[in-house]
């Protein structure tokens, strides 16, 4: 489809002139940030952003690429180098350490410098690094963690935990030898390492003793509590805090977020990860956008400001399954959360960053026609005289042979939410990719986000913008609308 205006050079010249005019008007804010929000699209590489943009545009009955995402409207962009100290292609644990603590670590470790070794408990002590969220709390700000994964998962754990193994969700996951050496599971660290005002996501089962039935799935033993130490961590968390509330469904979340007596809120909406957006029961489970809104309601009551981590964590899971439909619909919900947060905050006093921890081996090619479905087929046939999809994976479970050859694919098959895009190499799970990812920035000190940077730069920009350690002598004017 060729839109009639786009045939005319004037259309493009006028559009570019408008963009240039807006760019010339950009004025770096010289004030500090009162609030910090980091939106983390887990696995959201640039190809994912592009494909999600097209899908979101097409859901609005447009051709696709011309409609900006909410994140596209952020004025400053940089590239982030995502490698871990010991790996070219990283995981979500060590990358979380980089963008949340400002220090690179080793693959599958969280909140520890690279002097700590994966799975070796005795390398933990003395190698802990402190997150910007922790520093924000010490500075008197309210802090929150929102995710579509388990709240004990690698990315959110980077805000509060220190562990040599990202898989140590509950004490049942920690080897006895490591427990004896004093290594704590991530769920325990969630409630004891620091005071988090808002915790929203999945991960109920890691908080309760083995045999505790889940409130949503009481007949499914596999969804019940997993803890061996007999503890009820939710109860412990509530007991330590006046004004604290625990919720496990959407209705309770909405009520709690509007209740002025609630000062601390923990919402755990699934035993493990939350459901994909396309499978979510909208009466029982909140969306990422709704959780973000609830968190902002509570956190913005603090006159000193807040730090909020918001993760679209299952973009990554969709890609690992080689199900682009899932990854892209998760990305759209993530973008919706960014848009809603933008409506509820001011760029005068809030530094908002959007980034990914790493990319995926997810490609978008084959010369598809403008306006054609992002899940559709390339116009021509491959050398084997069979159709191929415009979305593909370099490796993963989409590698299937039919009678010793690559199977043909139809438009109706490739458009199914369950369809796995084909890959060149057979793996049980598609892998992360090592190329740089984008960092989008808006608000006070956002202009510092430029060029090609180490992933650790993100944490340092946030700390500097809010005059947190080690930048308390930041020499920035106070945030807009505040006085000394």
């Amino acid at each position: 489809i060729i839109p009639v205006e786009e045939e005319n050079p004037d259309f493009w010249n006028r559009e570019a002139a408008e963009a240039l005019g807006a760019a010339k008007k950009l004025q770096p804010a010289q004030t500090a940030a009162k609030n910090l929000i980091i939106f983390l699209g887990d696995g959201m590489g640039v190809s994912t952003v592009t494909a999600a943009r097209i899908l979101k545009g097409q859901k609005k009955d447009k051709l696709g690429p011309e409609i900006p995402l909410a994140m596209d409207r952020f004025p400053y962009v940089a590239l982030s180098k995502t490698y871990n100290v010991d790996k070219h292609v990283p995981d979500s644990g060590a990358t979380a350490t980089a963008y949340l603590c400002g220090v690179k670590g080793n693959f599958q470790t969280i909140g520890l410098s690279a002097a700590a070794r994966f799975n070796q408990c005795n390398t933990t002590r003395g190698n802990e690094v402190i997150s910007v969220m922790n520093r924000a709390k010490k500075a008197g700000k309210s802090v929150g963690v929102v995710t579509t994964t388990r709240v004990q998962h690698a990315s959110p754990a980077g805000t509060y935990a220190h562990t040599v193994n990202r898989n140590w969700y509950s004490d049942a996951d920690v080897p006895a030898s490591a427990r004896q050496e004093g290594c704590q599971d991530i769920a325990t660290q969630l409630i004891s390492n620091m005071d988090i005002d808002v915790i929203l996501g999945g991960g109920r089962k890691y908080m309760f003793r083995m045999g505790t039935p889940d409130p949503e799935y009481p007949d499914d033993y596999s969804q019940g509590g997993t803890r061996l130490d007999g503890k009820n961590l939710v109860q412990e968390w509530l007991a330590k805090r006046q004004g604290a509330r625990y919720v496990w469904n959407r209705t309770e979340l909405m009520q709690a977020s509007l209740d002025p007596s609630v000062t601390h809120l923990m919402g755990l909406f699934e035993p493990g990860d939350m459901k994909y957006e396309i499978h979510r029961d909208s009466t029982l489970d909140p969306s990422l956008m709704e959780m973000t809104e609830a968190a902002l309601r509570l956190l913005s009551r603090n006159p000193r400001g807040f730090f909020l981590f918001v993760e679209g964590g299952r973009i990554d899971h969709g890609h690992h399954e080689s199900r682009a439909y899932r990854a892209l619909t998760e990305t759209i919900m993530f973008d919706d959360a960014i848009e809603r947060a933008g409506q509820l905050t001011s760029e005068e006093d809030t530094l908002s960053l959007v980034t990914a921890d790493h990319s995926h081996v997810f490609s978008f090619g084959g010369y598809p026609l403008r306006g054609s479905s992002i899940f559709g087929l390339a116009p021509g046939k491959a050398r084997d005289r069979k159709a191929y999809t415009v979305l593909l994976y370099g490796n993963g479970p989409g590698y299937v042979l039919k009678d010793g050859a690559r199977p043909d694919v139809t438009e109706s098959e490739s458009g199914s939410p369950e369809y796995r895009q084909q890959s060149a190499v057979p793996l049980d799970e598609e892998t992360h990719a090592g190329e740089d990812v984008a960092v989008f920035a808006r608000g006070p000190q956002a202009h510092l986000v430029h060029g090609v940077q180490e992933q650790t730069f993100i944490a340092h920009v946030m700390a500097f913008a809010a005059c947190l350690e080690p930048y308390t002598a930041c020499d920035l004017a106070p945030p807009a609308g505040t006085t000394d």
Epitope: I1, L63, L369, R370, S372, S373, G376
Partner: nanobody, 122 residues
Amino acid sequence: QVQLVESGGGLVQAGGSLRLSCAASGRAFGDYNIGWFRQAPGKEREFVARRTWDGSSTRYDDSVKGRFTVSIDNAKNTAYLQMNSLKTEDTAVYYCAAGRYSRVRGWEYDYWGQGTQVTVSS
């Protein structure tokens, strides 16, 4: 100028099928889009389905999804609307239309046929 002529309408029992045709003359369709619309007595004209001439994008109203299919025969310069599992509420005059996509105004239709009556009886 493009002239559009619909045919294929008629009386059919609920649950039955019809295939409407929309023949274009005067100018090759090229990169025009084809839309099908309908207007029931005393109601507004409503969107049914559309397809780009190159087949890159197809869209159906929720009320007809899974029952109606738009197709195009480029060689014959003709578009079709295959209607299966017809319901009494599908009774209307059906129009085909051709137009260009505009980034500013969206899907626009500059040329319209005269319409063909479809009546679905119970």
